[in-house]
C-alpha cells in the first residue's frame, strides 16, 4: 500500500512551488494533452550559459514515513534538436531534499539541501519524436531515508537542460491490513529494522472464534521495506464449534459439530446421535447408545453386543472344547471380546459353585478375541456349566450382560500325561500322571505297546502305580506306547500314542 504525501500532477497546478531565482528558470506551464489540461514545471535555458535554477516544493508533512519514495515523470529534450545545437545545453538535472520541523515558507537556502541524485533520462526527446505526441516520458524513482524531522522539502536544480517535470509523487509504503490464515495483521509502516534485518516482524491477532493451536506458534508475518507481507509463520485455527469460511470462523450449522480447533470443517452428526444445535462441539448419543471414552466424537454412537451365537461344549475326557460364533448384533463396534465363566455342580448333592480355581483354560478366559477355548482339568462325574459373555467398548457403561450358557457332564478321567523316564538297548522306563483330583477314581493303568510298523501283535501290561519298565525289547527299535486309566465304570480316557526308541548296541545309555 502506498501512502501519498505529495502528488504534483493531482493538484492541477495549485501547489505554487518556490522558484529561485524568482521569475527565472523554472516556470509553471499548462498544456493540453489528449484534450486534457496538464500542468508542468518547465525550464529550457539552454542558450543562456551556466544555469542554477531551483524549484522547491511546498513543505511536506512526513506523517509516519521513515523512508520515502520519490517518483518523477519528466521529459528531457535532446540538445541536438535546437538549431545549431546549444553549447551550454545539458540533459540532466539534480534532485535534492531538506528535512525540517517547520515550514520555512519563502525562505530558501541552498545549503540546507542534500543532493539525492543526478536525474538523467533513459530517453531524450529528439526533434523527430515530436510528431503525434511521441514525447518520451521518463520515469525515475529514488528512495530517501531514514527521515527524522516532522517534514521535508524536495528541490530540483536545473543546470541548463530543457526539461519538463510533469509528475512528482512522494509516497511511503505500508504493508496493508491483511487477513491471512485467520489472523488479522495491522497496517504496518514498511521500514527496515536494520541493514541486516530488512523485515519487520508483526504479530497477528486471531479473528473472532479462532485460536492459536495448542503447542503451536502464534501468527507472525514480515513486512518488507517494499510494503509487502512475506513469510507467514504460525496460524490460527477455528475453535471447536466453528469452521473456516473464507477469512472468518462460522458456527457449525445445526446437525453438524466440530470437537476441536483444527483446519477441518464441521462434520455431520454421526449415526445414532441426536441433532445438534448451532455451534455444537459434539453430538449427544441417542438413548441406548453410548460412546466409549476413547471413541472419537466423529464416530457413531454404539451399544453393547447381543449374546454370542451357537455355543457348543464338546467333552473330550476331562477336557471340554467350547465353540461359539460372533453375536448377531455387534452394537456397531469391532472391539468385541469374550469372557468365559465356569460353574460346577455335584450330581449327588446338587450343590454348585464356581470352578475357575480348579480348571485350566487354554488362554486367559476374560479377554478372548477368538471364538473357542479349551477347558481342562475337569473332574469326572461332575456337571459343568459354562457361560460365554460378549463384550465391547461400551459394555462397561451398562449393567445388563449378554451371555449364552452350555452345560456338560464329565464321565471320563483325563488322559494320562506320559513321558519316557529312562531307556537301554532292551528296555524303556515309562512314567505318567493324571490330576490329583481324579486319582482316587482310577483302579489300574493299562500300558499297551508294540513295535512300530508291526500292526499284527501288541503287548499289554497293567499296574497300579505311575510307572512301568518294559523289558525284552529289541535294540535300536521304535515302540508305540499308550497308557489308559481303568475306573470302576470301565475304561477312562487313553493317552495319545507315543513313539519311544531303545538304544543301539553301539550307543551308551541316555
Amino acid at each position: 500500500k502506498e501512502v501519498v504525501l505529495l502528488d504534483f500532477a493531482a493538484m492541477k497546478g495549485e501547489l505554487g512551488w518556490l522558484t529561485h531565482p524568482y521569475g527565472k528558470g523554472w516556470d509553471l506551464m499548462q498544456n493540453i494533452m489528449d484534450d486534457m489540461p496538464i500542468y508542468m514545471y518547465s525550464v529550457c535555458n539552454v542558450v543562456s550559459g551556466d544555469q542554477d535554477n531551483w524549484l522547491r516544493t511546498n513543505w511536506v508533512y512526513r506523517e509516519e514515513a521513515e523512508r520515502i519514495f520519490i517518483e518523477l515523470k519528466f521529459t528531457v529534450r535532446d540538445c541536438n534538436s535546437f538549431p545549431g545545437g546549444a553549447s551550454s545545453c545539458k540533459e540532466t538535472f539534480n534532485l535534492y531534499y531538506a528535512e525540517s520541523d517547520v515550514d520555512y515558507g519563502t525562505n530558501f537556502q541552498k545549503r540546507q539541501f542534500t543532493k539525492i541524485d543526478t536525474i538523467a533520462p533513459d530517453e531524450i526527446t529528439v526533434s523527430s519524436d515530436f510528431e503525434a505526441r511521441n514525447v518520451k516520458l521518463n520515469v525515475e524513482e529514488r528512495m530517501v531515508g531514514p527521515l527524522t524531522r516532522k517534514g521535508f522539502y524536495l528541490a530540483f536544480q536545473d543546470i541548463g537542460a530543457c526539461v519538463a517535470l510533469l509528475s512528482v509523487r512522494v509516497y511511503y509504503k505500508k504493508c496493508p491490513e491483511m487477513l491471512q490464515s485467520l489472523a488479522r495483521f495491522p497496517e504496518t509502516i514498511a521500514v527496515a529494522v536494520s541493514d541486516t534485518q530488512p523485515l519487520a516482524t508483526v504479530a497477528g491477532t486471531c479473528v473472532d472464534h479462532a485460536v492459536v493451536p495448542y503447542g503451536g506458534e502464534g501468527p507472525l508475518m514480515h513486512c518488507t521495506v517494499d510494503g509487502e507481507w512475506l513469510v507467514p509463520i504460525g496460524q490460527c485455527l477455528c475453535q471447536e464449534g466453528y469452521e473456516k469460511v473464507e477469512d472468518a470462523c462460522r458456527a457449525c450449522s445445526p446437525g453438524f459439530f466440530k470437537s476441536e480447533a483444527s483446519e477441518s470443517p464441521c462434520l455431520e452428526c454421526p449415526e445414532h446421535t441426536l441433532p445438534s444445535t448451532e455451534g455444537a462441539t459434539s453430538c449427544q448419543c441417542e438413548e441406548g447408545y453410548f460412546r466409549a471414552p476413547e471413541d472419537p466424537l466423529s464416530m457413531s454412537c454404539t451399544r453393547p453386543p447381543s449374546a454370542p451365537n451357537y455355543l457348543t461344549a464338546i467333552g473330550m475326557g476331562a477336557k471340554v472344547e467350547l465353540r461359539w460364533t460372533a453375536p448377531k448384533d455387534t452394537g456397531g463396534r469391532q472391539d468385541i471380546v469374550y469372557s468365559v465363566t465356569c460353574e460346577q455342580c455335584w450330581p449327588e448333592s446338587g450343590e454348585c459353585g464356581p470352578c475357575e480355581a480348579s480348571v485350566r483354560y487354554s488362554e486367559p478366559p476374560h479377554a478372548l478375541t477368538r471364538t473357542s477355548v479349551t477347558v481342562s482339568d475337569l473332574e469326572p462325574h461332575m456337571n459343568y456349566t459354562f457361560a460365554v459373555e460378549a463384550r465391547n467398548g461400551v459394555s462397561g457403561l451398562v449393567t445388563s450382560r449378554s451371555f449364552r450358557t452350555a452345560s456338560v457332564s464329565i464321565n471320563q478321567t483325563e488322559p494320562p500325561k506320559v513321558r519316557l523316564e529312562d531307556r537301554s538297548t532292551t528296555s524303556l522306563s515309562v512314567t505318567w500322571s493324571i490330576p490329583v483330583s481324579q486319582q482316587s477314581r482310577v483302579w489300574k493303568y493299562e500300558v499297551t505297546y508294540r513295535k512300530k510298523g508291526d500292526a499284527n501283535s501288541y503287548n499289554v501290561r497293567r499296574t497300579e502305580g505311575f510307572s512301568v519298565t518294559l523289558d525284552d525289547l529289541a535294540p535300536d527299535t521304535t515302540y508305540l506306547v499308550q497308557v489308559q486309566a481303568l475306573t470302576q465304570e470301565g475304561q477312562g480316557a487313553g493317552s495319545k500314542v507315543h513313539e519311544f526308541q531303545t538304544l543301539s548296541t553301539e550307543g551308551s545309555a541316555n
Epitope: 498544456n31 550559459g49 538549431p83 545549431g84 551550454s88 515530436f130 511521441n134 514525447v135 530543457c162
Partner: antibody, heavy 121, light 106 residues
Framework: QVQLLQSGAEVKKPGASVKVPCKAS????????MSWVRQAPGQGLEWMGW????????TYAQGFTGRFVFSLDTSVSTAYLQISSLKAEDTAVYYC??????????????WGQGTLVTVSS | EIVLTQSPATLSVSPGERATLSCRAS??????PAWYQQKPGQAPRLLIY???TRATGIPDRFSASGSGTDFTLTISRVEPEDFAVYYC????????FGQGTKVEIK
C-alpha cells in the same frame, strides 16, 4: 515591459552593406537566443537563423550563409544583423524576434517592429 | 528541408463563424507547430507553440491540433480583430514557415 526596438528603414545600393540593430529591454538579454526573420514585400516569412546571446554563437538557415552575419553587443543588450554585398532581392523587412524554447517546441514570442531594407540602384 | 504548405491561401469567413486553417508538412515534423498572426504593417505575433500552448494574452478561441504531417489552427468564433494572415512554423534543428493563409471578411 519586454521590447525589441529596431532602427528605421534603410535604403542601400547594390553591393553595399547594412547593419540592422535590435535593442532588447525588459528582460535579461543573455537569457534568450535571438532569431532573425526576413519578409520580402508581399511575401511570407523566412527564418534566417539565430544567435546564442550568451555565447555569441550564430546558426544560419539554408540560403543565409556567407553574406549574412549575426553579432552582439551584450553591454548594450543589442543584436545585429549585417548584410554585405547587397542585392536587389535582399529588399525586405527584417525582424528580430526573441526565441522561446520549450521541451515541446519552440517559437518567437517577442518581435521587433521590423526594419525595411531597400536595395536599389 | 521540410516544406510547410498552408491551405487555403485565402479563407473568407463572417464574424462569429468558425475558421479552420490547415498546415501540411512534406514529412513528419514536430507536433503542433507554432502559429503566428500578422496584420498588415505589423510584426507577426506568436499565438500557439509547443503542445498547443497559447502564448501570453492569446484568447482561448484559438486552438491547435494535429500530428505527423497534418496540423490545424482553429478559431472557434472569429472576431473582427482576427482578420489577418496566419503562418505555421515547424521547429527542430532548422525552422521553416508555411506560405501563410489570409483570413478575410466574407
Amino acid at each position: 515591459q519586454v521590447q525589441l526596438l529596431q532602427s528605421g528603414a534603410e535604403v542601400k545600393k547594390p553591393g553595399a552593406s547594412v547593419k540592422v540593430p535590435c535593442k532588447a529591454s525588459g528582460y535579461t538579454f543573455t537569457s534568450r537566443a535571438m532569431s532573425w526573420v526576413r519578409q520580402a514585400p508581399g511575401q511570407g516569412l523566412e527564418w534566417m537563423g539565430w544567435i546564442n546571446t550568451n555565447t555569441g554563437n550564430p546558426t544560419y538557415a539554408q540560403g543565409f550563409t556567407g553574406r549574412f552575419v549575426f553579432s552582439l553587443d551584450t553591454s548594450v543588450s543589442t543584436a545585429y544583423l549585417q548584410i554585405s554585398s547587397l542585392k536587389a532581392e535582399d529588399t525586405a523587412v527584417y525582424y528580430c524576434a526573441r526565441v522561446r524554447l520549450t521541451v515541446y517546441g519552440d517559437g518567437m514570442d517577442v518581435w521587433g517592429q521590423g526594419t525595411l531594407v531597400t536595395v536599389s540602384s | 528541408e521540410i516544406v510547410l504548405t498552408q491551405s487555403p491561401a485565402t479563407l473568407s469567413v463572417s464574424p462569429g463563424e468558425r475558421a479552420t486553417l490547415s498546415c501540411r508538412a512534406s514529412q513528419s515534423v514536430s507536433s503542433n507547430p507554432a502559429w503566428y498572426q500578422q496584420k498588415p504593417g505589423q510584426a507577426p505575433r506568436l499565438l500557439i507553440y509547443g503542445l498547443s500552448t497559447r502564448a501570453t494574452g492569446i484568447p482561448d478561441r484559438f486552438s491547435a491540433s494535429g500530428s505527423g504531417t497534418d496540423f490545424t489552427l482553429t478559431i472557434s468564433r472569429v472576431e473582427p480583430e482576427d482578420f489577418a494572415v496566419y503562418y505555421c512554423q515547424q521547429y527542430g534543428p532548422s525552422w521553416t514557415f508555411g506560405q501563410g493563409t489570409k483570413v478575410e471578411i466574407k
